[in-house]
Interface confidence: low
C-alpha cells in the first residue's frame, strides 16, 4: 500500500508526500514524477511556481537539489528563510516535487484521477488529492530495485511529518499533509504480492547532490529537518485542512 498525498499545481509544480513521511529516494522521486506524466522541476520552474503562490514546509527533490519553497518567513519552515531554500546536506529521503508541463500557468486544484504512467504491479497506490478525494490504482511506478527491495527501519523512517501549505498570498486555505509515525514491518521483498505487507522505506545513502544556484537560500539539514512529535489528530478523509505536526 502506497499513499501519495499531492498538492494543487502551481505553474505546473506540485508536492508529493509518500506514506505520510519523508520516504522517497532520489531515484524513486524521478520514477514517481514520471508516473504522474511529469518530471522533477528545474530550479527555474520551482522559482516560477513560487512566484505564483507555491510554498510548502517540506523538503523535496527537484532536479539536482532538495528544497523548500517559501514565500512567508516561518521559523519552523526552512529556518525563517524565503525563496527556494536549498538543503545543503541531503543524504536522506525526502518528499518530492514534480512538474507537469501541461498544467495551467498559475494555480490548478482539480483532482488528479489517474497515475497515467504507472505500470502493472501488485501495489495498491492511493492518490490523495487536496480536497480529500482519493484515486486508487493497482500497479507500480518504481524501477530501482533499491526502492523496492526490503529495507530496514531507522529513526528517520518513523519521524513525524509536517505541513505542506498553500500560501496565504494566494488567498486560500492551508493544506496540511498528515504524517503518521509508525514502524516499518519486516518485508520479504518485491515478490510479496500482498500489499498489506509492503511498506518500503529504503534508504538511498549512495546519493549526494550538490547545492547552489541563483535566487536561493541554503541550509544544512539541521536548519529544518528536525524530528517532532504529533501535535494532534488528523482528518485524512474530508476537507482540505489537516492538523499539522511539527514542521520539518
Amino acid at each position: 500500500q502506497i499513499d501519495l498525498n499531492i498538492t494543487c499545481r502551481f505553474a505546473g509544480v506540485f508536492h508529493v508526500e509518500k506514506n505520510g513521511r519523508y520516504s522517497i529516494s532520489r531515484t524513486e522521486a524521478a520514477d514517481l514524477c514520471k508516473a504522474f506524466n511529469s518530471t522533477l522541476p528545474t530550479m527555474a520552474q520551482m522559482e516560477k511556481a513560487l512566484s505564483v503562490g507555491f510554498e510548502t514546509c517540506r523538503y523535496g527533490f527537484i532536479e539536482g537539489h532538495v528544497v523548500i519553497p517559501r514565500i512567508q518567513p516561518n521559523s519552523i519552515c526552512a529556518a525563517n528563510h524565503t525563496g527556494v531554500y536549498i538543503l545543503t546536506s541531503n543524504t536522506s529521503q525526502y518528499d518530492t516535487y514534480c512538474f507537469n508541463a501541461s498544467a495551467p500557468p498559475k494555480e490548478d486544484c482539480t483532482s488528479v484521477t489517474d497515475l497515467p504512467n504507472a505500470f502493472d504491479g501488485p501495489i495498491t497506490i492511493t492518490i490523495v488529492n487536496p480536497d480529500g478525494t482519493r484515486y486508487i490504482k493497482k500497479g507500480e511506478y518504481r524501477t530501482n530495485p533499491e526502492d523496492i527491495y526490503p529495507s530496514n527501519p531507522t529513526d528517520d523512517d518513523v519521524s513525524s511529518g509536517s505541513s505542506s501549505e498553500r500560501s496565504s498570498t494566494s488567498g486560500g486555505y492551508i493544506f496540511h499533509t498528515f504524517s503518521t509515525a509508525h514502524p516499518i514491518p519486516d518485508e520479504d521483498g518485491p515478490w510479496i504480492t500482498d500489499s498489506t505487507d509492503r511498506i518500503p522505506a529504503t534508504r538511498d545513502q549512495d546519493a549526494f547532490y550538490p547545492s547552489g544556484g541563483s535566487h536561493t537560500t541554503h541550509g544544512s539539514e539541521s536548519a529544518g529537518h528536525s524530528h517532532g512529535s504529533q501535535e494532534g489528530g488528523a482528518n485524512t478523509t474530508s476537507g482540505p485542512v489537516r492538523t499539522p505536526q511539527i514542521p520539518e
Epitope: T27, F119, D120, G121, P122, E140, R142, T143, N144, P145, E146, I148, Y149, P150, S151, N152, P153, T154, D186, E187, D188, G189, P190, W191, T193, T202, R203, D204, Q205, D206, A207
Partner: antibody, heavy 117, light 108 residues
Framework: QVQLVQSGAEVKKPGASVKVSCKAS????????MHWVRQAPGQRLEWMGW????????KYSQKFQGRVTITRDTSASTAYMELSSLRSEDTAVYYC??????????WGQGTLVTVSS | EIVLTQSPGTLSLSPGERATLSCRAS???????LAWYQQKPGQAPRLLIY???SRATGIPDRFSGSGSGTDFTLTISRLEPEDFAVYYC?????????FGGGTKVEIK
C-alpha cells in the same frame, strides 16, 4: 565509498560447517538488507537468502532452508553466512551483496569454499 | 521458481560490433523486476541494468536493456575490448531470486 570485504578462502571436509563473514563500510549497515549468493565452478549464480540487518529477520531460498543461517553483528557492521552439512557440490565462491542501487550493486570480493575429503 | 534461460550461450563478435543478448523467463517477471550483470573472471558480478531498462550509475550508454513479461534483451551497441565477459540476467520479482545461465561474449 561503499565496500563489502569478505573473509578468506576456506577448505572444509564433507559434513562440516563453514562461516563466511562480510564486513560493510561506507554506509549505514543497518539501513540495507544483505543478501548471499553463491557460484559453483562454471555454474550460474544462486541466491541463498537475505537478512534484514536492522532487526535480524531472515529469508532463505528453499534449496538451502535448514542448512544455511545468516546472522549479523551490527556493532561490527558485519554479516555472516553459515552453511552446514557441507558436501562436495557446495564447493563454490560465496558472495555477500547489498542489492541494489542505481549507483551500483556493491558485492563482496567473494570467498572460495572448497569441500573436499 | 522462475527459470531464466539465456541465449545464445556464447556470442563471438569483434570490437565495434553490436551484441544482442536474450533472457527468457519461464513465467512473467513481475513489474519488469529484471537486472543484468557483467562478470569477468575472478571478479564479482557488476550491475549494469535494473528494472529491465534503467542503467546503473557509471554504466556507459552503449549498454541498454529492454523487454517486459517473459522476454528481455540486453544490447551492447558497440563492443569495446573491456566488454568481453559473461553476462547474467536476474529476476527479483518472486522468491527465490534467480539468475540466468549466462551468455559469454567472446572476441571473434
Amino acid at each position: 565509498q561503499v565496500q563489502l570485504v569478505q573473509s578468506g578462502a576456506e577448505v572444509k571436509k564433507p559434513g562440516a560447517s563453514v562461516k563466511v563473514s562480510c564486513k560493510a563500510s561506507g554506509y549505514t549497515f543497518t539501513n540495507y538488507a544483505m543478501h548471499w549468493v553463491r557460484q559453483a565452478p562454471g555454474q550460474r549464480l544462486e541466491w541463498m537468502g537475505w537478512i534484514n540487518t536492522g532487526n535480524g529477520n531472515t529469508k532463505y531460498s528453499q534449496k538451502f532452508q535448514g542448512r544455511v543461517t545468516i546472522t549479523r553483528d551490527t556493532s561490527a557492521s558485519t554479516a555472516y553466512m553459515e552453511l552446514s552439512s557441507l558436501r562436495s557440490e557446495d564447493t563454490a565462491v560465496y558472495y555477500c551483496a547489498r542489492f541494489y542501487s542505481g549507483s551500483g550493486s556493491p558485492w563482496g570480493q567473494g570467498t572460495l569454499v572448497t569441500v573436499s575429503s | 521458481e522462475i527459470v531464466l534461460t539465456q541465449s545464445p550461450g556464447t556470442l563471438s563478435l569483434s570490437p565495434g560490433e553490436r551484441a544482442t543478448l536474450s533472457c527468457r523467463a519461464s513465467q512473467s517477471v513481475s513489474s519488469s523486476y529484471l537486472a543484468w550483470y557483467q562478470q569477468k573472471p575472478g571478479q564479482a558480478p557488476r550491475l549494469l541494468i535494473y528494472g529491465a531498462s534503467s542503467r546503473a550509475t557509471g554504466i556507459p550508454d552503449r549498454f541498454s536493456g529492454s523487454g517486459s513479461g517473459t522476454d528481455f534483451t540486453l544490447t551492447i551497441s558497440r563492443l569495446e575490448p573491456e566488454d568481453f565477459a559473461v553476462y547474467y540476467c536476474q529476476q527479483y520479482g518472486s522468491s527465490p531470486l534467480t539468475f540466468g545461465g549466462g551468455t559469454k561474449v567472446e572476441i571473434k
